[in-house]
Interface confidence: medium
């Protein structure tokens, strides 16, 4: 009975040609959508002139189909029981699932101005930047279309920089026709408890972005976990989007299309300051913005973004300290809408439904030498957008799953 089932499961979750797991792993059978909500700034002049609170109004969803491309360069290594691959990126706009078009305009922080003023802090260089910012008619805020903001536009200020720099700016630029990886994961042939766990990412076992244990690449990519998941487990996974490994804990039993699944959620503790969660000390990389590592709920990933002052948080600064959201008006965090969860079928370890939610923010600081930033009296971590990437097992696949897996066990 149970032993036979365990044996069958162990065989079918191995990542090699011919297994159920492999077929769904190479190309996900689930439709994955990424919804974007853009934070449209309502009072750009008041902020720039008076250092007022930034009033934002979220606009969305703008929906794209993602993760529809099969993994590439899939290569088995029989010697160390791993399989390596590239995960290609692609996004297709879905007008019927969106509130508007890719041509919709938004008032957002000027990404290039904020980034350049942060990266180049030398006073003389800032005077030159100021000259170029004025010459290009750039300002603290800009109006951009959705397509430009997400996928890239030629920045007029950077275009004037007299030495070679990338003049194209976009929150996800470059995206289409690029790939994430190389990932090398254990295929589970020799040890099923290691299946899908990442051995190396881009040829390394650590990231070089963080100190100590924070820099480790832990767990899987969250698409699946080793089988026979227990409620007491802490599920580790790595997300290249946020340049770190993170973890999820059991929250509740959920019935998904007749399949019993465990809902694992990212707990607030994962976003806590080192004061509350000492394990997070190595995610605090500087003392000023973090107020001596007492702020929480935002992650400075600038090291992972060529020095650009990108901060990742949960949407609407859910689980973030009050000082982070205080300069921003118009945010309404709530767990139901803004937390991340994974619904995992415990026998196979497959993630059958998920909602990955995150917010992209940019730091902008006052600058005496840069005219469009010189009236600011405080630092702002400015929300640009938040996203909700979701996938749910299809009805047909759910029927198959029920009959072949959960049905046999029950």
């Amino acid at each position: 009975g149970d032993l036979l089932i365990q044996k069958t499961i162990k065989k079918q979750v191995v990542l090699e040609e011919g297994t159920i797991a492999f077929k769904n792993w190479v190309k996900t059978g689930t439709e994955v959508y990424r919804q974007f909500w853009i934070f449209d700034v309502q009072n750009p002049q008041e902020v720039m002139m008076n250092s007022s609170n930034i009033q934002v109004k979220q606009r969305g969803p703008y929906t794209y189909r993602v993760r529809f491309l099969a993994k590439e360069n899939v290569t088995q290594d029989a010697e160390d029981n791993t399989v390596s691959f590239l995960q290609p990126n692609g996004a297709i706009f879905e007008p019927s699932l969106s509130v508007g078009t890719e041509a919709d305009n938004f008032t957002v922080l000027n990404l290039a101005v904020a980034a350049a003023s942060h990266i180049y802090q030398n006073q003389f260089v800032q005077m030159i930047l100021n000259s170029l910012i004025n010459k290009s008619k750039s300002s603290m805020f800009q109006v951009r279309t959705l397509r430009e903001l997400l996928w890239g536009y030629r920045d007029p200020f950077l275009s004037l920089v007299p030495y070679p720099v990338t003049t194209t700016v976009g929150l996800f630029y470059p995206y289409n026709n690029t790939a994430d990886g190389v990932y090398k994961v254990f295929n589970g042939k020799d040890n099923i408890s290691k299946v899908a766990i990442i051995d190396t990412y881009k040829g390394k076992r650590n990231l070089s972005y963080w100190e100590s244990h924070c820099d480790m690449i832990n767990g899987t990519d969250a698409a699946s976990f080793p089988p026979f998941v227990e409620k007491s487990q802490v599920l580790q996974f790595f997300s290249s989007d946020i340049c770190r490994s993170i973890y999820a804990v059991f929250e509740s039993d959920v019935n998904l299309k007749g399949i019993p699944v465990y809902r694992f959620v990212l707990p607030s503790k994962a976003f806590a300051s080192p004061v509350e969660n000492p394990d997070n000390y190595c995610f605090c990389t500087e003392k000023i913005i973090s107020k001596n590592c007492t702020s929480y709920g935002v992650l400075d990933i600038s090291k992972c973004k060529e020095g650009r002052p990108v901060y990742i948080s949960l949407p609407h600064f859910l689980y973030a300290s009050p000082d982070v959201s205080e300069p921003i008006d118009g945010l309404n965090p709530n767990e139901e809408e803004h937390r991340t969860y994974l619904d995992i079928e415990p026998i196979t370890g497959f993630t059958l439904q998920f909602a990955k939610r995150l917010q992209v923010n940019l730091l902008v600081k006052p600058s005496e030498k840069i005219q469009v930033l010189k009236n600011l009296k405080r630092n702002y971590i400015v929300p640009i957008l938040w996203l909700n990437e979701t996938g749910t097992i299809g009805d047909e696949k759910a029927n198959m799953f029920r009959s072949q897996v959960t049905g046999k066990i029950n």
Epitope: Q42, N43, P44, M49, L132, N134, K137, V372, L373
Partner: antibody, heavy 129, light 105 residues
């Protein structure tokens, strides 16, 4: 052709309020920022107020800040300037101005006066008791 | 405020240059007024852009913090006061020059 017609000027009393209206035609009004510029007798030009195409960005000149309100009605293709607590130094010709763009380009505390591509004929305001 | 010469003069057919100095790299608009209190006409906006109704003899340029309006082959009906407009970062305010009176001899 672009036409901007101002109205509402005339003799005003100190401490009172005025309301000037600019009626636009000959272009897609909702696509352009609009503003007001004034000229005191025998003097140069002075920025009064500006508003972005969608009504979002608003800016006022330092001499009228706190006393002026600019509003626009894209359906009617009009932009209105209301000025309260009138003073003698508010006397002058008030011109309606159209930006070449959807918003004014802003410096650290006000817009650049460099992108006006059309003007009204002006309406004269005299503040006197 | 922006600094421009109070007056310039030229004979018909000559080239006239009117300058406007700001306090940093900037952009300029040039506005023509034929008599005080009368209508204004934009001859150049954004330093170099000429409205379609303005003859090609009017052109604009910038170098550093100075904007220049050039009238090539000046004509009698170009006689007017020319105001420049920009932003003055020394006073942190929207600014116009005091105006340059062009006299065609």
């Amino acid at each position: 052709a672009v036409t901007l017609d101002e109205s509402g000027g005339g003799l005003q009393t100190p401490g009172g309020a005025l309301s000037l209206v600019c009626k636009a035609s000959g272009f897609d009004f909702s696509s352009y920022a609009m503003g007001w510029v004034r000229q005191a007798p025998g003097k140069g030009l002075e920025w009064v107020a500006g508003k972005a195409k969608d009504g979002g960005g608003t800016a006022y000149g330092s001499a009228v800040k706190g006393r002026a309100t600019i509003s626009r009605d894209n359906g009617q293709s009009t932009v209105r300037l209301q000025l309260s607590n009138l003073r003698a130094e508010d006397t002058g010709v008030y011109y309606c101005a159209k930006s070449a763009y959807g918003d004014w380009f802003y410096g650290s505390s006000g817009p650049y006066a460099d992108s006006i591509d059309a003007w009204g004929h002006g309406t004269e305001v005299i503040v006197s008791s | 405020a922006l600094t421009q010469p109070s007056s310039v003069s030229a004979s018909p057919g000559e080239t006239v240059k009117i300058t406007c100095s700001g306090s940093s790299d900037s952009w300029y608009g040039w506005y023509q007024q034929k008599s005080p209190g009368s209508a204004l006409v934009t001859v150049i906006y954004d330093s170099t852009n000429r409205p379609s109704s303005i003859p090609s003899r009017f052109s604009g340029s910038t170098s550093g913090s100075t904007g220049t309006l050039t009238i090539t082959g000046v004509r009698a009906d170009d006689e007017a006061v020319y105001f420049c407009g920009s932003f003055d970062s020394s006073t942190d305010s929207t600014a116009f020059g005091a105006g340059t009176t062009l006299t065609v001899l």
